[in-house]
């Protein structure tokens, strides 16, 4: 079975995921966006796709390079880097993205429900959209034997990059880097994207989708998750950063809003796009770290404030134990610090992708739908892509995040790793992704990054009454985004924070949903290798900073079913903003310790610049998933 | 920094054409969008169209939409606004924008291109 | 126009004051305000849920609901007497919206 998990188009460019994990060739990622009736976009349409608000926190293949778009700097995420970011020394399989001419000229995140140019063949291909919703259906794209029956699964990458783009500069990158709005955005919204304005729809949707007599199943999840991890700028704000131990390949697109303090974030658009395999840096799916993370990006970060869905409040802690790199995305902090209004073009060689975007176990959350019906929260189903970010405005009444919604994990959440995980170039432990040094990108993206989890130990969450709760926020967008689970038995969402980028501008029904992972760690998991456990939600604060409230989610473990239920308690807050971290886009937490600078003329549109916070490791697949506390 | 920067007042007779830019610097000129507002004197502001320069996709506001003309010239840097045939109603202050990736925000302006059209 | 403001508020020096923009797409976008003073060109000064640009003083802020978009300016100075401006997408989203204008007299 091959699921997968596709963003919003951005100007006709989307991302996709294989199987919740770096794993695709370049010759697969053609065949992939063939059948998709699409191309591997060229640098141009990505750049263009980026002006609109498409950022992923995932390497993936376009025309000739691996990269990944960057709009707000995140230390996890082509190392703080913004721009199109490539990847020069590519020597593994990635995500791929894609370009479909036919699609609107801003963001679509209208669902996708088949591979129109699939062929005949045996393999059960589930394509998961970011409002979860899922379409199956039988056939093959590959064409490449090798792709098929790979003879090394795990780090076969067929990807190219030209050696000529590689910066001569240490560290190998070439930074096309753009500049950046005003860099410093307000304290109220760290998690803020500019890429969106979207209001996020603030309901977060149990779906339980009903299979169509068809083969083709649709199945929306709740938008809980996108909502936790958008960015201000959509009104609604999913505050619970919380990442679910199931990565899934899913990154939550939908922006969210985590208050209206968090300003920017909605008009980032949260193109999350995959499931946050990248280097965590843009997903908020590893972002989520049992530690409190002091976040002060509030104030520095407003504009930023895609990923926290309470970006503005340091204390908001996430308590999931899966890394909270992506989180900060929007770091006001890292906006400030990071953003350069007069940045370089977008074009950015990154020499190592491993030390940041090496996947990084994204928190998959595995709703169960309430009840059969397909419901998308209030929200509109229309994803603005990537990252909800077309900003589904909650109001602030939405901003409450109803975050009442229940995230059930089943018994076996506490094992999100226990997916195998290939160790992988990319691949380094939770602990190297802390060293800077080692990964001054957030080297254990893969590892950490995302969490492989059983069907049994995807956390399901149960949309509560409270139609909030699945609020994601887009920059532009001020309506809430729902979430959809994935309700597929190992189907867990991943969050990206590229995704979450909130995007007000277009208002869509986001869900996390993510293709079956069963890697944790970031990287390509070895689905034989089993990773350590995390319990996943360990309980986090949220903060609404409009509603002035924090909320704290404890895990409550359902009698009935085993699952992990969130429970609210609101605690009065001014202004408290979910930890920033948890936009993917802010860069305030650099998990290498250093930030990275995109350095170059502004003539050329070309900066040269190595990592400073460290040097580039492509040190290997020291998989081990340690989740830091 | 970032700047855009427009060209001067200019002072038409109607039925002239004409033709008003907006250099771009500080940042990847090709990589934003590029806005243009019409500010009609005592009015308020009026979004006419935008351009992306990277590929010269460009969008135009029902209400402009075949009145005016937008293009850029990506190899200096440059938006355009043009008329063919100017109108004493096209008097008014233009200002150029640059589109915030993602949203419809505009974060930098022009200082504005003052048109006079009068016979 | 789809945006619609008042025309003109006022207020007095260090009060605190709201201005306020109506419009159907304000339910799914976020709003973004400009300032613009005699003679010059608009400044952005909030965009998205409430994020202010650098340089922007935090007695302005932002926020959202329903169909409205409001700009809070706590403890207005001399200053900030201008006119404001709300922009957003359109209903079809492909298109920017500006309201007309709301001229801020600080007493």
């Known amino acids: 079975q091959i699921d997968l998990n596709i963003t919003c188009r951005f100007a006709g460019v989307f991302h996709v995921e294989k199987n919740g994990r770096y794993s695709i060739s370049r010759t697969e990622a053609a065949d992939l966006c063939k059948a998709f009736n699409s191309t591997l976009p060229t640098m141009a349409q990505m750049e263009k796709a980026l002006s609109i608000g498409f950022e992923t926190c995932r390497y993936g293949f376009i025309e000739g390079h691996v990269v990944i778009p960057r709009i707000h700097p995140n230390s996890i995420c082509a190392a703080n880097n913004t721009g199109v970011y490539i990847l020069t020394s590519n020597t593994s399989q990635y995500d791929t993205y894609c370009f479909n001419a036919s699609a609107p000229p801003e963001e679509d995140c209208t669902s996708v429900t088949d591979l129109p140019n699939a062929f005949d063949g045996p393999i059960t291909i589930t394509i998961v959209n970011r409002d979860g919703t899922r379409y199956v259906q039988k056939g093959e794209y590959r064409t490449n034997p090798e792709d098929i029956y790979p003879s090394n699964p795990t780090d076969d990458d067929v990807s190219s990059g030209s050696s000529s783009e590689r910066s001569s500069t240490s560290g190998g990158y070439i930074f096309y880097t753009f500049s950046t709005v005003h860099p410093i955005p307000d304290e109220d919204s760290p998690w803020i994207t500019d890429s969106t304005d979207r209001i996020p729809a603030t309901t977060l949707m149990s779906t339980s989708a009903t299979a169509t007599e068809t083969a083709t199943k649709r199945q929306e999840t709740w938008d809980w998750f996108s909502w936790l991890f958008l960015p201000s700028e959509s009104k609604n704000h999913l505050h619970t950063t919380t990442q679910m131990a199931g990565t899934s390949s899913n990154t939550i697109s939908a922006g969210w809003e985590p208050n209206e303090e968090n300003e920017d974030e909605r008009d980032r658009h949260l193109s999350f796009s995959g499931s946050g395999i990248d280097d965590d840096e843009d997903f908020i799916s590893s972002t989520i770290s049992t530690t409190p993370r002091a976040f002060d990006h509030t104030k520095q970060n407003q504009d930023w404030t895609q990923w926290n869905p309470s970006h503005s409040n340091p204390e908001v802690l996430l308590q999931t134990t899966t890394r909270m790199t992506d989180v900060d995305r929007n770091g006001t902090t890292a906006y400030e610090g990071n953003w350069n209004p007069e940045a370089h073009p977008p074009l950015i060689h990154h020499e190592h992708h491993e030390e940041e975007e090496t996947p990084h176990s994204t928190s998959t959350i595995q709703a169960t739908p309430s009840s059969t019906t397909e419901e998308t929260a209030t929200q509109k189903e229309q994803w603005f892509g990537n990252r909800w970010h077309e900003g589904y405005r909650q109001t602030p009444k939405e901003d409450s995040h109803s975050t009442t919604g229940t995230a059930a994990a089943s018994a076996h959440t506490s094992h999100p790793m226990q997916g195998r995980t290939t160790p992988s170039p990319e691949d380094s432990s939770w602990t190297d992704f802390f060293n800077p040094i080692s990964h001054p990108m957030g080297r254990g993206h893969q590892a950490g990054r995302r969490m492989d989890m059983d069907s049994s130990h995807s956390i399901t969450l149960q949309p509560t009454a409270n139609p909030n709760t699945g609020l994601v926020e887009d920059l532009d967008r001020t309506g809430p985004l729902s979430m959809t689970t994935q309700q597929s038995n190992s189907q867990s969402f991943s969050t990206s924070h590229e995704g979450l980028e909130e995007d007000k501008d277009h208002p869509t029904t986001s869900t996390l949903t993510s293709s079956n992972r069963n890697d944790v760690t970031g990287g390509r998991r070895d689905p034989n290798h089993s990773e350590g456990s995390t319990t996943l939600l360990e309980g986090y604060t949220s903060h609404y900073p409009h509603t002035k409230e924090s909320r704290t989610f404890i895990p409550v473990t359902s009698a009935k079913t085993g699952s992990f239920g969130v429970t609210a308690v609101t605690v009065g807050d001014s202004n408290s903003n979910v930890n920033r971290s948890l936009s993917g886009d802010q860069d305030t937490f650099h998990p290498s310790g250093g930030s990275h600078t995109t350095h170059g003329s502004e003539s050329d549109g070309h900066s040269h610049g190595s990592q400073e916070g460290g040097a580039n490791t492509t040190s290997g697949p020291i998989r081990t998933p340690q989740i830091p506390e | 920094q970032v700047q855009l920067v427009q060209s001067g007042a200019e002072v038409k007779k109607p039925g002239e054409s004409l033709k008003i830019s907006c250099k771009g610097s500080?940042?990847?000129?090709?990589?934003?969008?590029i806005g243009w507002v019409r500010q009609m004197p005592g009015k308020g502001l009026e979004w006419m169209g935008i351009?992306?320069?990277?590929?010269?996709?460009?969008r135009y506001s029902p209400s402009f939409q075949g009145q005016v003309t937008i293009s850029a010239d990506k190899s200096i840097s440059t938006a355009y606004l043009q008329w063919s045939s100017l109108k004493a109603s096209d008097t008014a202050m233009y200002y150029c924008?640059?589109?915030?990736?993602?949203?419809?925000?505009?974060?930098?302006w022009g200082q504005g291109t003052l048109v006079t059209v009068s016979s | 126009s789809e945006l619609t403001q008042d025309p003109a508020v006022s207020v007095a020096l260090g009060q605190t004051v709201r201005i306020t923009c109506q419009g159907d797409?304000?339910?799914?976008?976020?709003a973004s305000w400009y300032q613009q003073k005699p003679g010059q060109a608009p400044l952005l000064v909030i965009y998205?849920?409430?994020i202010r640009p650098s340089g922007i003083p935090d007695r302005f802020s932002g926020s959202s609901s329903g169909n409205t978009a409001s700009l809070t300016i706590t403890g207005a100075q001399a200053e900030d007497e201008a006119d404001y401006y709300c922009?957003?997408?359109?209903?079809?989203?492909?298109?920017?919206?500006f309201g007309g204008g709301t001229k801020l007299t600080v007493l």
């Open positions: 924008a640059r589109r915030l990736h993602g949203p419809f925000y505009f974060d930098y």
């Open positions: 922009n957003s997408r359109d209903s079809s989203g492909n298109h920017v919206v």
């Open positions: 998205g849920k409430n």
């Open positions: 797409s304000l339910r799914s976008y976020y």
């Open positions: 500080g940042y990847s000129f090709t990589s934003y969008w």
């Open positions: 351009i992306y320069p990277g590929d010269s996709d460009t």
